[in-house]
Amino acid sequence: MMTGTIETTGNISAEKGGSIILQCHLSSTTAQVTQVNWEQQDQLLAICNADLGWHISPSFKDRVAPGPGLGLTLQSLTVNDTGEYFCIYHTYPDGTYTGRIFLEVLESSVAEHGARFQIP
């Protein structure tokens, strides 16, 4: 029986060009975490395996960094990064737990101020 629950950062926002940490935490179970997969919609971003360590998908290597912990850091954010992210915890003996995070990437306040307060 699966008793665990995934806690996530929920809905988060970040500025374009900035970075954000995607974090999930599995609680209320003694199951062994064997692997965590990170997905963005239908794309595999990264995998953290208990034996093999981290694998970052080559197409995301420039902008995705492993950690902290089992989390994932997204860098140099663009508006195209807006969307759903999933942490998929593979555990033994429970099975699979999935957490969801929604990220909204906003135009930076610097850019907004630059547009509003132009020097004549």
């Epitope: 064997t34 239908d42 794309q43 595999l44 034996d51 093999l52 197409s59």
Partner: antibody, heavy 118, light 107 residues
């Protein structure tokens, strides 16, 4: 250099048994999930079974469930496939494959032929 | 079980041609899709993993794309050594399943 070497294939009568081995070298065997995949003569690839690294959890195709057992001996860097109650339709080349992150199969052995016939 | 349907089952092409092979899953498999090349009497060889990642040592003329249910393997300029059979495989869930294969023959 990663190497996988299967052995144990041969001719066996229907209802008989066979144990295949896959000797691994060139990598930390205990860290990787491993799989068996077979290919009947002139046919496509069919997954047979997989075994996880840390937990030893095993998974099977419906066609072999209850008859085949996948196992591993990390101290000997060897993967096994115990095949019982063999049928003519089990005739195939059997490959072992390394399965990093249980997502892809990056190295394959050369295969061993199992023929089930009377 | 997830069914993988490959098309075409065979094709004839010339050296230098651009070749496209498609693979469709019976349900969404995210990007858990791999492509293998197999030559007669040899073991399969991994070309593309996780839908679009090129395996180390594989020539860049091979590329993969797609997500969800529809995937494509493209060979940008077919070389003599590329005449072989190609298989897709899903690793989204067990049982792991392969497509029926696409045989690329010389025209």
């Amino acid at each position: 250099e990663v190497q996988l070497l299967e052995s144990g294939g041969g001719l066996v009568q229907p209802g008989g048994s066979l144990r295949l081995s896959c000797a691994a070298s060139g990598f930390t065997f205990s860290s990787y999930a491993m799989s068996w995949v077979r290919q009947a003569p002139g046919k496509g690839l069919e997954w047979v079974a997989s075994i996880k690294s840390s937990t030893g959890t095993s998974y099977y195709a419906d066609s072999v469930k209850g008859r085949f057992t996948i196992s591993r001996d990390n101290s000997k860097n060897t993967l096994y496939l115990q095949m019982n109650s063999l049928r003519a339709e089990d005739t195939a080349v059997y490959y072992c494959a390394r399965e990093p992150y249980s997502v892809w199969m990056d190295y394959w052995g050369q295969g061993t032929l199992v023929t089930v016939s009377s | 079980d997830i069914q993988m349907t490959q098309s075409p089952s065979s094709l004839s092409a010339s050296v230098g041609d651009r070749v496209t092979i498609t693979c469709r899953a019976s349900q969404s498999i995210s990007s858990y899709l791999n492509w293998y090349q197999q030559k007669p009497g040899k073991a399969p060889k991994l070309l593309i993993y996780a839908a679009s990642s090129l395996q180390s040592g594989v020539p860049s003329r091979f590329s993969g794309s797609g997500s969800g249910t529809d995937f494509t393997l493209t060979i940008s300029s077919l070389q003599p050594e590329d005449f072989a059979t190609y298989y897709c495989q899903q690793s989204y869930s067990t049982p792991l399943t392969f497509g029926g294969g696409t045989k690329v023959e010389i025209k």
